[in-house]
């Protein structure tokens, strides 16, 4: 297993609709054809897997149907979007990239993107 640098923004504020997008960029040492991207969430010292996708270079990322993540790839960049976020989902979202094929296998883990999610203020009651 060889190490690889992964860059991601330090902090992002999700939209009022609970959507957060960020780019995960990896310094590919070779010509990988199969890449696996995993998003991990760290909060209160607990790490959980949010979503994962394996893709062939030049193809779209395919997450599971019930995944809260979507994404696109362009060269050594992966544009990740996480939706359905609530304030309780605030945390550090870490991008993990694995170059699966061809060998050698490379692994890179970013420093994480602190995603803040603000629940919208409830609308005041209306008489209409």
């Amino acid at each position: 297993c060889k190490a690889m640098h992964v860059a991601q923004p330090a902090v992002v504020l999700a939209s009022s609709r609970g959507i957060a997008s960020f780019v995960c960029e990896y310094a590919s040492p070779g010509k990988a054809t199969e890449v696996r991207v995993t998003v991990l969430r760290q909060a209160d010292s607990q790490v959980t897997e949010v979503c994962a996708a394996t893709y062939m270079m030049g193809n779209e990322l395919t997450f599971l149907d019930d995944s809260i993540c979507t994404g696109t790839s362009s060269g050594n960049q992966v544009n990740l979007t996480i939706q359905g976020l609530r304030a309780m989902d605030t945390g550090l979202y870490i991008c993990k990239v694995e170059l699966m094929y061809p060998p050698p296998y490379y692994l890179g883990i970013g420093n994480g993107t602190q995603i803040y999610v603000i629940d919208p203020e409830p609308c005041p009651d209306s008489d209409f």
């Epitope: 923004p9 902090v11 992002v12 504020l13 999700a14 602190q114």
Partner: antibody
């Protein structure tokens, strides 16, 4: 090294607006947030809100909602805070700071005086 | 909104003594989202602690943070002359983010 340089002191009349700038250098501007805090003379710190330079999304203190607007110009790595309908109790030193989990780097502060 | 109450308002101590500052929240705050700042007259604040207990870059190890839920503490193990200042806590776990009113640590 990381630096945040704010615009100079302002004197404004009640009802006017002020726009304070905060120019960042020494880091990738869009990777971080910019938080704004103010301090009235002899008082504590008051959080005003913050902007994610990555996507422009903002979160404002409820008491300032409707009067404050925070923006960024990523081409010049500059953040702006505009406060409208100024009142005498808006007289304060306004600070910007680089935000992730707390403000690790601060601007030098901008004194805004509201007086008729 | 979450109200942060700092106590005592003023702490009078001598260099070399231990300082214990309290920050109490009106509602529970995730320990991942509490910070402490130091501020000297005429200066911008300085981040000491984030995530309740993680020291910011360049902060001496005599500063330590602890606590969870509604009760948080900043401890300065041995006061140095440069530590006499005002200390503020901030929660950023629930919007709107809020700051305490400050504790002044003065020379006895």
């Amino acid at each position: 090294q990381v630096q945040l340089v704010q615009s100079g002191a302002e004197v404004k009349k009640p009802g006017a607006s002020v726009k304070v700038s905060c120019k960042a250098s020494g880091y990738t501007f869009t990777s971080y947030g910019i938080s704004w805090v103010r301090q009235a003379p002899g008082q504590g710190l008051e959080w005003m809100g913050w902007i994610s330079a990555y996507n422009g999304n903002t979160n404002y203190a409820q008491k300032l909602q409707g009067r404050v607007t925070m923006t960024t110009d990523t081409s010049t790595s500059t953040a702006y805070m505009e406060l409208r309908s100024l009142r005498s109790d808006d007289t304060a030193v306004y600070y910007c700071g680089r935000w992730v989990r707390g403000v690790e780097y601060w601007g030098q502060g901008t004194l805004v005086t509201v007086s008729s | 909104e979450i109200v942060l109450t700092q106590s005592p308002g003023t702490l009078s101590l001598s260099p070399g003594e231990r300082a214990t500052l309290s920050c109490r929240a009106s509602q529970s705050v995730s320990s991942s989202y509490l910070a402490w700042y130091q501020q000297k007259p005429g200066q911008a604040p300085r981040l000491l602690i984030y995530g309740a207990s993680s020291r910011a870059t360049g902060i001496p190890d005599r500063f330590s943070g602890s606590g969870s839920g509604t009760d948080f503490t900043l401890t300065i193990s041995r006061l140095e002359p440069e530590d006499f200042a005002v200390y503020h806590c901030q929660q950023y776990g629930r919007s709107p983010w809020t700051l305490g009113q400050g504790t002044k640590v003065e020379i006895k």
